[in-house]
Structures are given as structure tokens and as C-alpha cells.
Interface confidence: low
């Protein structure tokens, strides 16, 4: 019963001219040990002779091995389990079917294995994940349907022709289930890798190029933006105009929406790549950026700090502290919104200018009763002088003086 023979090996093996082929193979002949083994190339059954015709690459009988002209073919098996074969070197005309003619005392079997030998080293195959996103680690896999103990090879990864510095893990399989060499590379692509060429290069033991496979990276990323402003220093005076332009340097997939933000809040009805601010007011000072979104998410430009300069506003005075007790100290603070900040201050006491007082703060170390009254100030910057505000009242408390009896 020929069904007693059970074989396991790869269905097809791949190699190229001058390399070698290692054929992992196991078998079971349940009725006894192997008595004779012949390895045929492209065997054909001859009905007249009831035998197989074809090139005999290897013969081994119970009387011993028949000397083979082809020392390159080796049967590495045994009489009851192992049918592993090696052909080194392997040639183009070895392509086709290998026939393992096995005979025990009572049974015969012809097992066929396909051998595919190419003229030149065939390329490996790069496998990429279905989607690659910026900054997310992915594993790139390079698979070659070849491995042979007598012919060491290596797989090297290149990005735009430059070796990738990340450590790749190479594994080989020479089992009855599969024969392959695989290299896996963990890689965190940046948006700038989009469109770049990754190559897996097959090299011999000396690093000589044999073949390669290339893929173009499709790195999904949020839009990358540049913001330009006129004037370039983003410093203007009230009433001037400002133009900001948003440029998309890269987006994958294509962008879908555009918006502008001021101090983190979206500006209504501003959905084009140019933001025109006419006759700006001081309220329009702040941090501006553009935001462009695609299916991956929103991308934001760097922030531009728009400074709208204006003359000081009417000043107010803050007194620390009123009422004040005679002999205590008091500090006056002149407060006025201005851009740039005021550089000079004028102080007034009861409407009369206080000489020599030009700072934001006035400090009186020892209050006397006559210091009581209204204090006001005027702030000044390069754009002009502000108005005097309403002022603040200093109340000075003191004990009775010059007591007279009535």
C-alpha cells in the first residue's frame, strides 16, 4: 500500500545559478528501512520498462553508494526518517522536478520536489504595514525565499541609498515547512520620510550586491505649515494693516480645512490661506497661527506674536495704602496700558506737577499731613503722551495738633 509513505518538505525550492539548494525533507516508510534511493532530475515513467527514466543525480543502494559524477549532489538522509538533500553549486538547468525514488523491501515510492533556479539572484520582497503614520513605530519585513547552509547571504536595509542605522533582526528557516531568510526592521518614520525610497538589498557573504527590492514610503502625516507675516517683525501701529500667509509644505493625505487661531481661539470666517487685518486696533495684539487639517488630524504652524503699538491710555493711580497714618510710608503706582511700555511719567499732586518724579512708582518714606490730597499721573512712550486720569485721594490721619481750649 503506497499510502504508507509520508513525506514532508517544501513543495518548491528557489535558488539561482551558482548558489546552492538545501532541501529539508522527512519521510516515513512504515514497513521497513530504505533499501535503495535514486535522485532523478525530471523523471518520467516508462510504461514499457515499468521504470522511471531521467537524469540520475544520485544513487544509493543497499550495496553502498554508486559513485556520482556530480559530487555537488549529496543525500544527507538516513534509512527511515531523513531525506534531506543538498546541491552545491546549483545550476540553471537543475530547474524542474526532482524525483526521490525510494524503495524498501516491499514498497516503492516516487516523491517529487520542484526546483526553481533562476539565472540571476532573484529579489527579496519588502512587506510594509497597510498604513504608516508619522512617529508610530512600524516593522518593515524583507523576505527572501532562499536559505542554504553552503551559501551565506545577508539582507541590508537602505533609505535613499544610505544604510539604515536601526538594528535589523535577521532570521532564517530551513525546515520541512519553509525555507526563507527574513529581515525585520523596527522603524519610526517621520513625516519627512514620506515619498522616500526604502531598499532591501540582498548581498553575498562579502557584501557584494546580488539583487534588491525597493518601495516608496507612504507616510501619513498631519499638514506641515509655515506662516509668513508682513511686516516681517509683526510690530505695527494702530491703524496699520497686517497680512499673514499660511503655506502647506507637506500633507498626506491632502488637506481638507484651513482656519486661523488667535491666542488659541478660532477666528470666525477666516478659512483661506491669507489672513488680512486692516486698520488694526490694540485688541488685535496676540499670538496668531494657522491650522490646516487632513484625515490624520490638524497641523498647526508656529505662532506669530502680533504687537500693535499705541500711545498710553489715560492713567490711573494706585495708592498703597490710604488712609495713611502720619509718619508711615506710602507708595504710589501709575498704571497705563501702552505698547511699547511707557518710558517717562509725570506726577501731579493737587493738580501741581511734582518735580523730579519721572518713574512709574513714587515712594514717600514718611508721610506728613500736608501730603494729603489728589495724586494723578501722565504716561509717555515713543508714540505719544497719554491723558491724565481722575487721580486717587490720599487721606492722612494724624493726632490733634495745637489744641486750644475754648
Amino acid at each position: 500500500d503506497s499510502s504508507k509513505w509520508v513525506f514532508e518538505h517544501p513543495e518548491t525550492l528557489y535558488a539561482w545559478e551558482g548558489a546552492c539548494v538545501w532541501i529539508p525533507c522527512t519521510y516515513r516508510a512504515l514497513d521497513g528501512d530504505l533499501e535503495s534511493f535514486i535522485l532523478f532530475h525530471n523523471p518520467e515513467y516508462n510504461k514499457n520498462t515499468s521504470k522511471f527514466d531521467g537524469t540520475r543525480l544520485y544513487e544509493s543502494t543497499k550495496d553502498g553508494k554508486v559513485p556520482s559524477e556530480q559530487k555537488r549532489v549529496q543525500f544527507l538522509g538516513d534509512k527511515n526518517k531523513n531525506c534531506t538533500l543538498s546541491i552545491h553549486p546549483v545550476h540553471l538547468n537543475d530547474s524542474g522536478q526532482l524525483g526521490l525514488r525510494m524503495e524498501s523491501k516491499t514498497e516503492k515510492w516516487m516523491e517529487r520536489i520542484h526546483l526553481n533556479v533562476s539565472e540571476r539572484p532573484f529579489p527579496p520582497h519588502i512587506q510594509l504595514p497597510p498604513e504608516i503614520q508619522e512617529s508610530q513605530e512600524v516593522t518593515l519585513t524583507c523576505l527572501l525565499n532562499f536559505s542554504c547552509y553552503g551559501y551565506p547571504i545577508q539582507l541590508q536595509w537602505l533609505l535613499e541609498g544610505v544604510p539604515m542605522r536601526q538594528a535589523a533582526v535577521t532570521s532564517t528557516s530551513l525546515t520541512i515547512k519553509s525555507v526563507f531568510t527574513r529581515s525585520e526592521l523596527k522603524f519610526s518614520p517621520q513625516w519627512s520620510h514620506h515619498g522616500k525610497i526604502v531598499t532591501c538589498q540582498l548581498q553575498d557573504a562579502d557584501g557584494k550586491f546580488l539583487s534588491n527590492d525597493t518601495v516608496q514610503l507612504n507616510v501619513k502625516h498631519t499638514p506641515k505649515l509655515e506662516i509668513k507675516v508682513t511686516p516681517s517683525d509683526a510690530i505695527v501701529r494702530e491703524g496699520d494693516s497686517v497680512t499673514m500667509t499660511c503655506e502647506v509644505s507637506s500633507s498626506n493625505p491632502e488637506y481638507t480645512t484651513v482656519s486661523w487661531l488667535k491666542d488659541g481661539t478660532s477666528l470666525k470666517k477666516q478659512n483661506t490661506f491669507t489672513l488680512n487685518l486692516r486698520e488694526v486696533t490694540k485688541d488685535q495684539s496676540g499670538k496668531y497661527c494657522c491650522q490646516v487639517s487632513n484625515d490624520v488630524g490638524p497641523g498647526r504652524s508656529e505662532e506669530v506674536f502680533l504687537q500693535v503699538q499705541y500711545a498710553p491710555e489715560p492713567s490711573t493711580v494706585q495708592i498703597l495704602h490710604s488712609p495713611a497714618v502720619e509718619g508711615s510710608q506710602v507708595e504710589f503706582l501709575c498704571m497705563s496700558l501702552a505698547n511699547p511700555l511707557p518710558t517717562n511719567y509725570t506726577w501731579y499732586h493737587n493738580g501741581k506737577e511734582m518735580q523730579g518724579r519721572t518713574e512709574e512708582k513714587v515712594h514717600i518714606p514718611k508721610i506728613l499731613p500736608w501730603h494729603a490730597g489728589t495724586y494723578s499721573c501722565v504716561a509717555e512712550n515713543i508714540l505719544g503722551t497719554g491723558q491724565r486720569g481722575p487721580g486717587a485721594e490720599l487721606d492722612v490721619q494724624y493726632p490733634p495738633k495745637k489744641v486750644t481750649t475754648v
Epitope: E8, E11, H125, T141, N145, K177, S178, V179
Partner: antibody, heavy 121, light 113 residues
């Protein structure tokens, strides 16, 4: 005849764990990889991972790493899948699948009858 | 992971009618080295385990009637039943075995009118 006999249905409490078994017969246990597949009620199939009984090598779907642990007992030709920290999301029918594949990836496959796991308090 | 999308999700046909169902993958399942498409079709009858019908996108498993035909390449695949019988009542799943993790489509439920 190749057969895969799976353990019976399980009703377990949230937070606990369960071990599903799959006993193989009719073939050399070490020559077929054992795959596991999840099918939630009325839903599609999800590939959990496989174990090679010959050497114990495993490969998991990233989604099930830490959730499922695959082991084998060669002496009894049995494969096991241990599921931990169970939640209602783990309620499903779990299938074992014995696969023999060649180097190109084609697979001869045989399926178990499925094991129903219900997670409920 | 490779995403598999099937359509329609369900369909009802009369016995003897021809039916086609579609399966699309998020990346090509055609392996350039051997020109094979790493796609299989499974049939799951009510209360049963899935059963493989077709592999390499178009090769029938032994014992599968030739009424069932798989076709397509790359990312678009089709399963056709030329003349539906009551036996065909089932959910049909496509599955890619191009790269790990292997993934299945959502299924197409075939009902008989």
C-alpha cells in the same frame, strides 16, 4: 481521520481567567501549527495567534498580546489557550485550527467545533 | 493590519439564481515573487465551524462544487455562486494570509428566498 476536539462551554465571572483546550487526533501533532480564532456573537472572525507544537514558537495578533497565552502538551496532543482578566468583550466562540502550510503560505486546515466562553457576573 | 471589507453584508436570492459577493483589501495581496494572491474564502453554515472553500483567490479546495468560483487580483476579489442551492445558506468570509495578523472580512450572509 483528523479531528480537533475542544473543551465544553464556559460561564465565568469578570476579572477571572479561563483555559480552553483543543485535543488533536489522527495526525502527527507536532507537524501542524495550531491557530486560534475568535468569533464574537453574530460577528466576524478574528485571528488570535498560533503556536508551533514542534518547538513551542508562538506568534500573536498584537490585539491579543497580554490577553491570550498559547501552550501545548505534546504528550497528550493538546493545545491550550489561556484568557485572563476577562470582560464582557471576551464573550465569544473560540476555535482552534490546525494548519499545515507550505513555504508559499497555502494551508491545509482543520477546525475544532468551537468553545463558547460567556463572561457575566 | 490589512483591512478586509466585504459587500454586501447580506443578500437573499432564489434557488437557481447566480450570486456574486465582493471582498476588498486595504493593500495588494498579490505577491510579486510567485504571482499568487494570498486570499482565501470560507463558508460558515449556521452552528458550524468555518470551512475553507477557495485559496490563492481562485483555487477550489477538493470537494468544493464548481458552482463556486473565486476571482480577482491585487485588492479586489469576488466569490461567485453560479446557481444557488439550499445548501449554500451560510455566511461567507474572505481572509488574507499575505501578512500577519491574518484578517477576515466582515462576512456576507446568503439567505434563500
Amino acid at each position: 481521520e483528523i479531528q480537533l476536539q475542544q473543551s465544553g462551554p464556559e460561564l465565568v465571572k469578570p476579572g477571572t481567567s479561563v483555559k480552553v483546550s483543543c485535543k488533536a487526533s489522527g495526525y502527527d501533532f507536532t507537524r501542524y501549527n495550531m491557530y486560534w480564532v475568535k468569533q464574537s456573537h453574530g460577528k466576524s472572525l478574528e485571528w488570535i495567534g498560533y503556536i508551533d507544537p514542534y518547538n513551542g514558537d508562538t506568534r500573536y495578533n498584537q490585539k491579543f498580546k497580554g490577553k491570550a497565552t498559547l501552550t501545548v502538551d505534546k504528550s497528550s496532543s493538546t493545545a491550550y489557550m489561556h484568557l485572563n482578566s476577562l470582560t464582557s468583550e471576551d464573550s465569544a466562540v473560540y476555535y482552534c485550527e490546525a494548519i499545515y502550510y507550505d513555504m508559499e503560505g497555502y494551508a491545509l486546515d482543520y477546525w475544532g467545533q468551537g468553545t463558547s466562553v460567556t463572561v457575566s457576573s | 493590519d490589512i483591512v478586509m471589507s466585504q459587500s454586501p453584508s447580506s443578500l437573499a436570492v432564489s434557488v437557481g439564481e447566480k450570486v456574486t459577493m465582493s471582498c476588498k483589501s486595504s493593500q495588494s495581496l498579490l505577491y510579486s515573487n510567485n504571482q499568487k494572491n494570498y486570499l482565501a474564502w470560507y463558508q460558515q453554515k449556521p452552528g458550524q465551524s468555518p470551512k475553507k472553500l477557495i485559496y490563492w483567490a481562485s483555487t477550489r479546495e477538493s470537494g468544493v462544487p464548481d458552482r463556486l468560483t473565486g476571482s480577482g487580483s491585487g485588492t479586489d476579489f469576488t466569490l461567485t455562486i453560479s446557481s444557488v442551492t439550499a445548501e449554500d445558506l451560510a455566511v461567507y468570509y474572505c481572509q488574507q494570509f499575505y501578512s500577519y495578523p491574518w484578517t477576515f472580512g466582515g462576512g456576507t450572509k446568503l439567505e434563500i428566498k
